[in-house]
Structures are given as C-alpha cells and as structure tokens.
C-alpha cells in the first residue's frame, strides 16, 4: 500500500524540527523532493529529507544511543565506583589502625625498643598499603625485614642492655642470627601465611572492583558503527522525512535494532555473569586468615607473642649469639631487668566477629547482593534501552523503519529491509576491539578470582602445626587463630565499625593503651570509643 502523502505539503514541520538539531535551513527542502540521493531513509514517494539531513540524523542517532547507554549504566557505575573508593579507604584505615595498635603495644610493653620499632612498623605497614594497591612487593620479604630489623634492637636493648657502645655494631650478625637460629620460632612464618593470604585476597578484591569500573567505562563510551547509526536513523528519524512527526518505533523492531547495535556488547554478558559470581565466591571466603581486617588488627598481638618467645629463650640465645657474634657477654639475661615483662597476660586474644554491626565484611556482602541485581545487565541492555526510549505500545500504530504499521513482526521487518541492511551481517562482525580487550581482562580476573576462592573446609594451614608451631593457645585451627596470648594491654573487643569510622579518622592517640604508665586493667578498652551513634556518610 502506498505511503500516505506528507500531511504538510510544505515540509514546514520537518523544517522546524530539524532546525532544533542544526540551526539554519539550507539543507531542508521547502517542499517534498524525490530524494533519489538518500541512502538510509529510502523514499517510496516524495520526501522532506536531503542527503545532508540524513547524515545529521545519523550523527544525532549515534549520540542519542551513547547517551542512552550511559544513562542505562549510571546506577551500576556509581555502585562500583563508590564501593571501590569506600573499600580502598576502609582498607587504608585498617592499615593505619593496625600500625597504631602495634606502635601502642611497643610503647606500653617494650619502651626500650622505641622509637626504632616505630620505624620498622611504619615501613612494614607502608609496604602493606602499597601491596594492597598493587605494588610489586613480596610479603615474605616485608615480614622478614620487620623481624630482621627488630631482632638487633631486641637483643641489644632488651636481652643484653649492658652491652658497651663498642659492641653495638653487631647488627648484621644479629640479622643473620635471627633467621639461622629461628629466634622468633615460627611466628614470622605464621605472620607471613596470615598476612600474605589476607592481603592477596584484599588486593584481588580491589583489582576486581577497579576492573568492574573499567568494564562499565568501556561499554559506556562505545562508539557505535555507521551501520548501527543507519539502523537507528531509520528507526528514529526516517518517519520525519514523511512528515510523521509523532509516530514511535514498534517495540519488537526496536529490540531487533538494539540487538544488532549491541551484538558486540552483549558478548560481554557471559563473562560479566561469571565475574559477579566469582566475586561473590571470593567475598564469601573473606574471613579468618583471609580477612585483612581480622589479620592486621590482630598483628600487634602476634608480634608481642613473638617477642615473648624470644624472652623465654633469652638465656640460651644470649650465650649462642655471644659466641656467634663474638662479643663478650656483658650481662646474664634477667627476665625482670626491664619493666617489659610486667604486662604479660596469657588470655587468648581473638578479634570478635560482631554480626549486628556494620563491618567491612557485611558491607562486602551488601555490595555483592546489589551487584547480583545487575547480573543480567549486558544481556538485558537492548531491552532496557528500548524501554527507556520512545516506543509505541503494542496495540497502536507504529513505525517499522519504512512505514506505519499496525503491529510489528520480525518477518515483516526483514522483508521491508531487504536490500537496505542486513541485521545478520551486523551480528556476524563480532565485538569491537575495545570490547574484545575488556572481555580478555574479564577472563583474566575471573581466572584469578577462581584461583583465589578459598576452600570451604577446614583444610587451611595444617602445615603450621606440622612444622612444630609452639603457641598452644590456638588449638588445632590455625586458620582461626590470630596470634596466641594477648598482650594484656590492648584488647580489641570488636571489629571496626568502619562505615561510621569513615566519618572521622582516629590518630595514634586513639589507639588503645597509649600511656607508658598504664596498667593492664586501665587498658581494657574497646576498639572505639562509642562510635555506634556516629552517622555513616555511606548509607
């Protein structure tokens, strides 16, 4: 059936609409023309469009499409960007508090090791931060450096404080002896295991979030092909050429066009789903020694235990090292020589898991739940965009790319589009190079996430027992044990309420037990001073 003649024989409506897109009317015919030069809006009769108008429509259609895509991903993008920032800051806060707790432990229990110990601790936690952010640092080296640096100071200031100045330059020998004699027992090994596992998981978690942002940014800024531009023009603008200003594209037709335009993007879907599910698995396993909050905030206790271990064996060690490092032994070790020994308490310190408080762990689970609602994001994109752009209701007249029709069917559309543009061809072209790249990155992170996903059973770290780990306080599940005996000075009563904590940071003075004269009783302070009512900026 022939198309209805343009209701406006002067192309007046088309001119006024087009002027909004492109000031000036030189490209718009005053009256309908044959339009034999048109390549997209192929006319079946006189048309109010010119070749130049068609080009402008194509450009506008592609821009519209980009905007629609950006608004479609806005909520998801904000979710990941906000959480990546929140977690990065929260991890920094954990590291800062862990450093403060460790410094406080040295200050209160081993004043003769300060301020040297503060430097070693400072360097260690700086490295921890850098590692989390992706720096190429070896965790074992970090831990070794901490204990290598600590031992000479422990030996000369704590175990053998009477050494003359001339004997103080045995530093290098003491660093070597630290490893050769295993002076800290298996504590360095325990810390290496706990820190490397928890930091690896933390690092991959942040990497995964940052890749999520990259995925959204990539698809957000896709430049649509000319072929797609033609299809969109035909769907959105070709009706104007016939003076049909108010008609909307048919729903089914929109879906077909969008699937064609989005064919490459939709290929991400499979890997995106896997990404969210793998991230969920990782998050489910982030507890005990795989939870950096748990591990780092308990480090001060493990380090304290390691120094106690040295003190226990001081007599034997002093004799051996005296021979090894060839200095005359100035003073037999006496356990009460320094006040360092007075604050030793054998209570087991474990960082309590408080279920009803908003911790990092609950925040992670909340993020996963929200992400899971976006699991079909890419496969649903064509439909989402159609539902958020003008589309005719099923029972009304709609535009099928060529004419007004009662109802849209793919068959009719294909027939109508014969010799114009093949949707199938568009799909066969495969994804854009940038999409292929991002798919490769997703594959890589998914593989990493899968290899990092922790075993569900209690099979972790049994080798620590086999190697003769001496702290009996931990029972037989080392994976659950952070340190052995508490230092009696700092009691971490619950995990940090991080989201409230992000409202304001605490300095060293806020670390528990910050006075040299403190008694163990005075220092049984909860981690934070009543942070419960602080408004969280992140809710």
């Amino acid at each position: 059936q022939p198309p209805p003649p343009p209701p406006d024989a002067t192309c007046h409506q088309v001119r006024s609409f087009f002027q909004r897109l492109q000031p000036g009317l030189k490209w718009v015919p005053e009256t309908p023309v044959p339009g034999s030069d048109l390549q997209v809006c192929l006319p079946k009769g006189p048309t109010c469009c010119s070749r130049k108008m068609e080009e402008k429509y194509q450009l506008t259609a592609r821009l519209n499409m980009e905007q629609l895509l950006q608004s479609a991903s806005m909520e998801l993008k904000f979710l990941i960007i906000q959480n990546a920032a929140v977690f990065q800051e929260a991890f920094e806060i954990v590291v800062r508090h862990a450093k403060n707790y460790t410094n406080a432990m040295f200050k209160n229990n081993y004043p003769s090791l300060t301020p040297q110990a503060f430097e070693f601790v400072g360097e260690f936690f700086t490295d921890v931060s850098l590692y989390i952010l992706g720096s190429d640092i070896n965790v074992d080296d970090m831990v070794n450096e901490l204990f290598d640096s600590l031992f000479p100071v422990i030996y000369t200031q704590l175990m053998n404080p009477g050494l003359p100045d001339s004997a103080l330059d045995i530093n290098e020998c003491l660093r070597g002896a630290r490893r050769d004699l295993k002076v800290f027992g298996n504590f360095p090994k325990l810390i290496m295991t706990q820190v490397s596992k928890s930091l690896q998981v933390t690092r991959i978690f942040l990497q995964a979030l940052n890749l999520g942002i990259e995925v959204i940014n990539t698809t957000d800024h896709l430049k649509f092909s000319k072929d797609c531009g033609r299809m969109l023009t035909r769907m959105w603008y070709c009706s104007y050429c016939q003076g049909l200003m108010m008609v909307k594209p048919c729903g089914g037709y929109c879906n077909v066009v969008m699937q064609g335009c989005m064919a490459g993007v939709v290929e991400i879907d499979k890997y995106w789903r896997e990404y969210i599910l793998s991230l969920e698995e990782l998050v489910n396993g982030m507890y005990r020694i795989y939870d950096m909050e748990n591990v780092l905030l308990g480090l001060f206790s493990t380090i304290h235990d390691s120094i106690q271990y040295v003190q226990k064996n001081a007599g034997k060690l002093t004799t051996t090292i005296g021979k090894l490092c060839a200095h005359s032994q100035q003073r037999q070790y006496r356990s009460a020589y320094y006040p360092e020994d007075l604050f030793i308490d054998k209570k087991v310190l474990k960082v309590a898991h408080v279920e009803h408080e908003e911790t990092l762990s609950s925040r992670r689970r909340e993020l996963i739940q929200k992400l899971k609602s976006f699991i079909s994001f890419y496969s649903a994109l064509p439909g989402y965009i159609c539902s958020h752009s003008p589309v005719a209701e099923n029972d009304t007249l709609c535009w099928n790319g060529q004419e007004l029709v009662e109802r849209y069917s793919q068959k009719a559309a294909r027939n109508g589009m014969k010799n114009q543009f093949n949707l199938h061809e568009l799909k066969m072209k495969g994804p854009e190079p940038v999409v292929s790249q991002i798919i490769d990155k997703l594959k890589h992170i998914n593989q990493l996430l899968r290899t990092m996903s922790m075993p569900k059973g209690r099979v972790l770290d049994k080798n620590l027992d086999e190697e003769g780990f001496e702290s009996g306080d931990c029972g037989d599940d080392e994976d659950e044990c952070i340190g052995g005996s508490g230092d009696g000075m700092i009691k971490v009563k619950n995990q940090l309420r991080f989201l409230a904590e992000l409202a304001y940071d605490l300095d060293v003075d806020d670390a528990p037990g910050n006075s040299q004269q403190a008694t163990p009783k005075d220092n049984e302070i909860s981690t934070f001073h009543n942070l419960g009512n602080v408004h969280s900026p992140l809710k």
């Epitope: 300060t114 301020p115 040297q116 400072g122 360097e123 450096e145 000479p152 530093n171 060293v508």
Partner: antibody
C-alpha cells in the same frame, strides 16, 4: 673507623633540584636506617625523613612529601637525598645521620651546605 | 616554629650548674623518649643523652637528663668553657615523625 662522608656544597637556582650523597664506612651500611636532617642558617634542626638501606623503604616528613626522594646504592654504601622545586628557604646545611640501635642518631655526616639563590 | 619548645639562650659562669628545659605534648615527649644533642659551632650535632636519662660512653657524667610528663630537661653541672654550644632536644612524635626543639644557645660567662 665509623664515618659518614657527605658531598660538597652546592649552589642552585630556585625551581632546580639538588642531590646530596652520604657515603658510609666502618659499619654494615644495610643494617641501620639513615635519616636526613637539615638546618637553615641560624635556625634549629628539622627532620626530613629516613631510608632503610636494606629494603629501600622510605618515610618522609609531611612537609617534604612530594619534593624529597631518598635512595641508596648498597654496592657503594651510599645514601642519597634529592630535593626538587627548590626555594630560597631551602637554603640550609643538610645532614645524614645514622639511627643507632638505641634509637638515637649516633653518627652524623659533616653536613652539606645547599644555597638556593637566583 | 619548632614542635618542641626550648629557651633560645642560657648562660652561667664556669663551675656552676645550668638547666635547659624542653617542652612538648602528649604525642611526643608525653609518651616517647627524649634525646639531647650538642652542636659545637661549625660542626654536626653529637649525641649527649638518649632515652631520657642515659649517657653514651664518652659523655661526662656532668651531663644528665630527666623527663616528667610532657617536659624534659638537660642539666650540666661543673660548667666548662668547652660546653659553650647549641643544645637540642628531640623526640619521636606519634604523627610518625621526629621532632626537634628550636635549640638553646649556652654561653659560659
């Protein structure tokens, strides 16, 4: 004989950079943190930061963050302090100091006068 | 402006005793050790007292240090002309940095 020997005096223009060296001898260089302290003419001492010669780890005073870089070359037992975007108030004697096992700065270099003037 | 506060100058006659004060806060002297350095004219500083009141070998027992609360002091008895120098107190600060006093110029009259 334990000593720290620093490089000679420097005159620099504002905006330039200066790199001061500190060669250690008489002890194991990698076993002790090296600190840098400066002293403006007629003024007190000001701590700039430290480097762990063993690992290369550093910690800088807030005031110098972004302008100071401390490095070391263990093969020649030398620590370096580079200060960039020099201003006239950076005119000072720059000292390297070894932080001993007791926590104090037990050995100091002889100092390097850096004059910043246009 | 130095973090630790010292009197800019002090003077006393030979053989007498002089005390130099150093005032800080809870984040430095209050909870950390104090160190004292002597700087003779045109030379690098030299350690005098470590960990509040301990003397390295080679430092005469005329020099003594003490600490109370957020203040510390250096006492020099039996003053000699060679003691004429600048004296600096230093402490670790919990802001994770070392802090120094502005220095006290000691004149032996």
């Amino acid at each position: 004989q334990m000593q720290l020997v620093q490089s000679g005096a420097e005159v620099k223009k504002p905006g330039a950079s200066v790199k001061v060296s500190c060669k250690a001898s008489g002890y194991t260089f990698t076993g002790y943190y090296m600190h840098w302290v400066r002293q403006a003419p007629g003024q007190g001492l000001e701590w700039m930061g430290w480097i762990n010669p063993n690992s290369g780890g550093t910690n800088y005073a807030q005031k110098f963050q972004g302008r100071v870089t401390m490095t070391r070359d263990t093969s020649i037992s030398t620590a370096y302090m580079e200060l960039s975007r020099l201003r006239s108030d950076d005119t000072a004697v720059y000292y390297c100091a070894r932080r001993g096992l007791r926590g104090d700065f037990d050995y100091w270099g002889q100092g390097t006068l850096v004059t910043v003037s246009s | 402006q130095s973090v630790l506060t010292q009197p800019p100058s002090a003077s006393e006659t030979p053989g007498q005793k002089v005390t130099i004060s150093c005032s800080g806060s809870s984040s430095n002297i209050g909870t950390n050790h104090v160190f004292w350095y002597q700087q003779l004219p045109g030379t690098a500083p030299k350690l005098l007292i470590y960990r509040n009141n301990l003397r390295p070998s080679g430092v005469p027992d005329r020099f003594s240090g003490s600490k109370s609360g957020t203040s510390a002091s250096l006492a020099i008895s039996g003053l000699r002309s060679e003691d004429e120098a600048d004296y600096y107190c230093a402490a670790w600060d919990d802001s994770l940095s070392w802090v120094f006093g502005g220095g006290t110029k000691l004149t032996v009259l």
